[in-house]
Amino acid sequence: GELETSDVVTVVLGQDAKLPCFYRGDPDEQVGQVAWARVDPNEGIRELALLHSKYGLHVNPAYEDRVEQPPPPRDPLDGSVLLRNAVQADEGEYECRVSTFPAGSFQARMRLRVLVPPLPSLNPGPPLEEGQGLTLAASCTAEGSPAPSVTWDTEVKGTQSSRSFTHPRSAAVTSEFHLVPSRSMNGQPLTCVVSHPGLLQDRRITHTLQVAFLAEASVRGLEDQNLWQVGREGATLKCLSEGQPPPKYNWTRLDGPLPSGVRVKGDTLGFPPLTTEHSGVYVCHVSNELSSRDSQVTVEVLDPEDPGKQVDLVSAS
């Protein structure tokens, strides 16, 4: 006769491990008992359970409620046992010893491998600002047994580097993603991908990139000279910029206070019916937590009664 078993049994933490041990013998042979033991290099051989043809399943008190026989129907030659709710400490070598009559004893050893799936965590790096050099965007850490694989999935150009720390029963892997921040990266996803044999599918954690920047400011509204004549209504100057965080806008007049009736509404300066007093140099001041920008324009309101005068539009930043 011979024993049918496995060299390695692999289970995920918390699952039940079936330790297989089947005696393939002649029809007239009987299995008297199957003794299961844990083989520890330090503690030696310690009995786990014993299946006896007459007295049934005996379980070591240290494994009470954790060792069972597989559900019926059972073959009398099947000495397999179930180890419930596998934990990391169960990982190791097991021995099955089958006593048969009249053939004698047979034994086999197998290794139980308990996979510990990782629970990854993603930590964003310091605030990203346009103009910085190579900067940490995020780091991702996952600990498991065996060591998990940690990679990045993103359209953003950058570099990744990994390091691992080995513990007695697991390994922690940390991967960092570095990039040179630019405004085009704003809102782009950066996804940490963790692979592990104990996971049915990869675990993914996504971080949305935020890069602080402030664009140059410019002013629109002076393109149509006909709008800037005495008496015209609806004349506006609009300050153009963009940034992250979104910028605030402030309007001033360089050569004095804003004329009465001129309304400031965010990025837009609205004028009442135009008079020559609205001529002057207007400054748009744009700022966010990162920086500030100015753009100024010179407005000259033309009096139609004075045909010798043209509207002089000068823009400077």
Epitope: G32, E47, K54, Y55, H58, V59, P61, P102
Partner: nanobody, 118 residues
Framework: EVQLVESGGGLVQAGGSLRLSCAAS????????MGWYRQAPGKQREYVAT???????NYADSVRGRFTISRDNAEDTVYLQMNSLKPEDTAVYYC????????????WGRGTQVTVSS
């Protein structure tokens, strides 16, 4: 030949405790499984509990949680700690031991009487 001698039986009130012992005469062969059966008047012999040399145990459902079997391999002695005794536990308790050589051979003790009064 292995001889088994039980002791510790007696009369006890319901809810009380007793501890049975069974000593095996020294054998050149190691005893594999040792344990206890019982037989109430007019009934068949009934399995109670057994223990292996490695300390693994098995119990009948009727005594699980109340009785505890233990063993001293060096002395070839088996014990049965019986707590929360009930009148239906009244029986003659027999020690059993199995010796494995070319095949399993089972030995029995003469028994010790346990009476639980209500």
């Amino acid at each position: 030949e292995v001889q088994l001698v039980e002791s510790g039986g007696g009369l006890v009130q319901a809810g009380g405790s007793l501890r049975l012992s069974c000593a095996a005469s020294r054998s050149t062969f190691s005893l594999n499984i040792m344990g206890w059966y019982r037989q109430a008047p007019g009934k068949q012999r009934e399995y109670v509990a057994t223990i292996t040399t490695g300390g693994s145990t098995n119990y009948a459902d009727s005594v699980r949680g109340r009785f505890t079997i233990s063993r001293d391999n060096a002395e070839d002695t088996v014990y049965l700690q019986m707590n929360s005794l009930k009148p239906e536990d009244t029986a003659v308790y027999y020690c059993t031991a199995e010796l494995v050589r070319r095949g399993p051979t089972t030995y029995w003790g003469r028994g010790t009487q346990v009476t639980v009064s209500s």
